[in-house]
């Protein structure tokens, strides 16, 4: 796995431990919490990042608690089970043997059950809406400039193939970035839209996951784009199923 050779760090994930013990003395980095080797030339999966976040000391974790307006994980931050590829396992269980099924971004999509609960497959979140509200500016941003800048950001910073940024909508002060990626469209090596959205969300909150890079400095034609708050809508290929009992107030 590639990593910065000179000081053996992982440019795409600061929640790692790196050492030159790879083949031929190459730098190898492992995610905190899971100890899994990560590919530092691309984004680390959200599952491994959440696991690393949960492994951080409690006092360090308070530093990265979501802000009042941020989208929090549905049942609070939890310590997920990740598969050998670093993806969320379809079934997640807590220490008291309460289990539930999640989608590919780790959001619960079934009622909670016991250890007998079956989650046949990891349902893909194929469509992500990122709604941003920017701080007041002298005038509205030019839509095409804004579109180009956000597409560039996802391409260059998050290494997301441009075809997965379906649209950038703008109605001042709301910006909506639409990411779309069906199972059939995602090739080996493609960054997952869920991972890109998670990195972006953390960047926007000033909690960058990148090693040693400055925080996100978004500018449209030199004008700073300051995000007031973010909402992320996750939409699955297969609709979630809940019992009516779950819906009872």
């Amino acid at each position: 796995h590639t990593a910065a050779q000179d000081n053996c760090t992982c440019p795409t994930n600061k929640m790692t431990v790196c050492s030159p013990d790879g083949p031929g003395g190459r730098c190898q980095c492992r995610a905190l919490g899971s100890g899994m080797a990560v590919d530092c030339s691309t984004l680390t999966s959200k599952c491994l990042l959440l696991k690393a976040r949960m492994s951080a000391p409690k006092n360090a974790r308070t530093l990265v608690r979501p802000s009042e307006h941020a989208l929090v994980d549905n049942d609070g931050l939890y310590d997920p089970d990740c598969d050998p590829e670093g993806r969320f396992k379809a079934r997640q269980c807590n220490q008291t043997s309460v289990c539930w099924c999640v989608n590919s971004v780790g959001v619960r999509r079934t009622d909670k059950g016991d250890l007998s609960l079956r989650c046949d497959e990891l349902v893909r979140t194929h469509h992500i809406l990122i709604d941003l509200r920017h701080r007041p500016t002298a005038g509205a941003f030019n839509h095409s400039d804004l579109d180009a800048e956000l597409r560039r950001l996802f391409r260059e910073r998050y290494r997301l193939h441009p075809k997965f940024v379906a649209a950038v909508h703008y109605e001042q002060p709301t910006i909506q970035i639409e990411l779309r990626q069906n199972t059939s469209q995602k090739a080996a090596g493609d960054v997952d839209i869920g991972d890109a959205a998670y990195y972006f969300e953390r960047d926007i909150k000033g909690e960058s996951l990148f090693q040693g890079r400055g925080g996100l400095d978004l500018r449209v034609r030199g004008e700073p784009l300051q995000v007031e708050r973010t909402l992320i809508y996750y939409l699955d290929e297969i609709p979630p199923k809940f019992s009516m009992k779950r819906l009872t107030a």
């Epitope: 941020a70 929090v72 379906a166 909508h169 909402l231 979630p240």
Partner: antibody, heavy 122, light 111 residues
């Protein structure tokens, strides 16, 4: 002025199909996600589903998933709701509604039509 | 059986202030999703009253205001008028259901 005019409601037997439509005017229809919301007699509002501004994506409420289909014709400024395998509990006033902002899809509703009554009864 | 919980009814005398609560959970209001409020006067279609928790569309009097905290939201109506009588619904988005969700509605009676 935004206008949304539903049509096609009526009485239908359980198990049958019905298509209701909504004619939109007063705004750039192709820029807005559109919703259907229903209200059973004397009951509250229930979301039926949304269709993206370009028609590429549709999402539905749990109770109609697999039976109802939302479509749109942006050249005709028309929204449709195809209802199959109708049940007595589908009896409601069906409202066509426009997303508040011209994003691809927006889960907040701005303007509403006056509704069309669909009665499912044998 | 609504995802968002509202009191079935509230009432107040003309000129008074009333509030309507809307309680959700960690997958809707508590997850940061916005709350919107709709007014449905007798025999008419719903009308947007408050959007994004606190904002009023043009034409809605400033007697109507919204707030949100944690997993709940509230609609406040001051200077109650007879023609405010009707049903009021809160609405949000639920990430577990992948769906837009409504409260069960609150009937406002002006005494």
């Amino acid at each position: 002025e935004v206008q949304l005019l539903e049509s096609g409601g009526g009485v239908v037997q359980p198990g049958m199909s019905l298509r209701v439509s909504c004619a939109a005017s007063g705004f750039t229809f192709s820029n807005y996600g559109m919703h259907w919301v229903r209200q059973a007699p004397g009951k509250g509002l229930e979301w039926v589903g949304i269709i993206w501004s370009d028609g590429t994506y549709t999402y539905y409420g749990d109770s109609v998933q697999g039976r109802f289909t939302i479509s749109r014709d942006n050249s005709e400024n028309t929204l449709h709701l195809q209802m199959n395998s109708l049940r007595a509990e589908d009896t409601a006033v069906y409202y066509c509604a426009k997303s508040l902002t011209p994003l691809g899809g927006s889960f907040r509703i701005g303007d509403w039509g006056q509704g069309t009554l669909v009665t499912v009864s044998s | 059986q609504s995802v968002l919980t509202q009191p079935p009814s509230v009432s107040g005398a003309p000129g008074q202030r009333v509030t309507i609560s809307c309680t959700g959970s960690s997958s809707n209001i508590g997850a940061g999703y916005d709350v919107h409020w709709y007014q449905q006067l007798p025999g008419t279609a719903p009308k947007l009253l408050i959007y994004d928790n606190t904002n009023r569309p043009s034409g809605v009097p400033d007697r109507f205001s919204g707030s949100k905290s944690g997993t709940s939201a509230s609609l406040a109506i001051t200077g109650l008028q007879a023609d405010d009588e009707g049903d009021y619904y809160c609405q949000s988005y639920d990430s577990r259901l992948n769906a837009l969700v409504f409260g069960g509605g609150t009937k406002l009676t002006v005494l």
